[in-house]
């Protein structure tokens, strides 16, 4: 059959020193005048007694019934509870994704930068060994990196022959910013990323 | 090679408006954060306004001396930054300088400044 | 907003000497830190980034060290061009700070 929920309020005697019985299904709850606080309002309230403020806050009562929460650095909030979004003013460099930290911020970095704020260039000659073929050389550059081809080769990683015999010509090439966000960025390609 | 020229600049009445333009060379506009600091005669760098870059989706930032009364701006087609100033004051008396924020939390190009003297 | 403590507010130094000038932060910017040079009627010009790197073209006898919320720039050997006005300036959040400047003068 359906079951019926005790009224626990019907029974005086459950919420002590004035306190308001609130029923609740298959429970109670005691509203308590100022002053007491506890399941029944039997205990004196005091306001930093146990602290209230959180995230290291420190507990500062104000009056008879009443506390301040004194926040450490990066917390807000009449008990600290929330955490100041650092984001807003965020500095991160050379297309870095801010992420709020407590009091700072930290930059999830395109591939090709690294650091806190993004502002370290990634030796992508360093991380790709192989990056320029056929005996090219690979130049770091900010923001990407460039191969000078050895003659007779040619293209982005000198991988491509110059059968023209116009072989003189040394092809540099210079991986510009937008094409590694293209390139990379925005194709899945996040194993490069630096998390902080 | 790097350039950033200011223009605009000039004298209006105090609660009077005027528009500063930044025209940039030498870089990938977009790319960049561009900011606007100010100097008034014999004192200190004021920073006044900031837009970051396409990546940061042009997001705007200003200090609070100016914030409600200055509109940072920029037309990329034509690789220049703006500053709408309105409501002018006369403690708005400076040289404004247009720089580039160079991808190290530096400026690290600066344009040869304008004067704005808010006087009656 | 970072408030910044530039010091001293002028030095009096001949050619040769060592200057050096301090930067004290409000609160940690993790290396954010930029040194400026500015000689009358001129724009600044940016000398050292990260608190430490020297800004392409800068002469070697620039430096700058520090960390946390204490920065110094040093001049090894002052010589007759860098007689100027030196700002600090903090890059970690906005708004950007500065200090209030050094002037370099003639002894």
């Known amino acids: 059959g359906s079951e019926t929920d005790v009224n626990e309020c019907d029974i005086p005697g459950h919420c002590q020193h004035g306190g308001t019985c609130l029923n609740l299904p298959g429970s109670y709850q005691c509203q308590c005048l100022q002053g007491f606080t506890g399941q029944y309002c039997d205990s004196l309230y005091v306001p930093c007694a146990p602290s209230p403020c959180v995230n290291g806050g420190t507990c500062r009562q104000t009056g008879d019934f009443t506390f301040e929460c004194n926040c450490l650095p990066g917390f807000e909030g009449s008990t600290c509870e929330r955490n100041i979004d650092d984001c807003p003013n965020h500095r991160c460099q050379n297309g870095g994704v801010c992420v709020d930290g407590v009091n700072t911020y930290n930059c999830r970095c395109p591939p090709q930068w690294t650091g806190q704020f993004c502002t370290e260039d990634v030796d992508e000659c360093l991380l790709q060994p192989n990056a320029c073929q056929n005996g090219g050389t690979c130049a770091n550059r900010n923001g990407g990196y460039g191969c000078v081809c050895v003659n007779g080769w040619s293209g982005d990683d000198c991988s491509e022959n110059i059968d023209d015999g116009n072989s003189g010509l040394n092809d540099i090439f210079e991986a510009q910013k937008i094409e590694w966000h293209e390139n990379l960025y925005f194709q899945g390609h996040h194993h490069h990323h630096h998390h902080h | 090679e790097v350039q950033l020229v200011e223009s605009g600049g000039g004298l209006v009445q105090p609660g009077g408006s005027l528009k500063l333009s930044c025209a940039v060379s030498g870089f990938t506009f977009s790319d960049f954060y561009m900011e606007w600091v100010r100097q008034a005669s014999g004192k200190g760098l004021e920073w006044v306004a900031a837009q970051r870059n396409k990546a940061n989706d042009f997001s705007i930032v200003y200090s609070a001396s100016v914030k409600d009364r200055f509109t940072i701006s920029r037309d990329d087609s034509k690789s220049t930054l703006y500053l709408q100033m309105n409501s002018l004051k006369t403690e708005d008396t400076a040289v404004y300088y247009c720089?580039?924020?160079?991808?190290?939390?530096?400026?690290?190009?600066w344009g040869q400044g304008t004067l704005v003297t808010v006087s009656s | 907003d970072i408030q910044m403590t530039q010091s001293p507010s002028s030095v009096s130094a001949s050619v040769g000497d060592r200057v050096t000038i301090t930067c004290q932060t409000s609160?940690?910017?993790?290396?954010?830190l930029a040194w400026y040079q500015q000689k009358p009627g001129k724009s600044p010009k940016l000398l050292i980034y990260g608190a430490s790197r020297l800004q392409d073209g800068v002469p070697s006898r620039f430096s700058g060290s520090g960390s946390g919320t204490d920065y110094t720039l040093t001049i090894s050997s002052l010589q007759p061009e860098d007689f100027a006005t030196y700002y600090c300036?903090?890059?970690?959040?906005?708004?950007?700070?500065f200090g209030g400047g050094t002037k370099v003068e003639i002894k």
């Open positions: 300036q903090q890059g970690f959040k906005y708004p950007l700070t």
């Open positions: 609160e940690d910017i993790y290396s954010g």
């Open positions: 720089s580039r924020d160079g991808g190290r939390l530096a400026l690290d190009a």
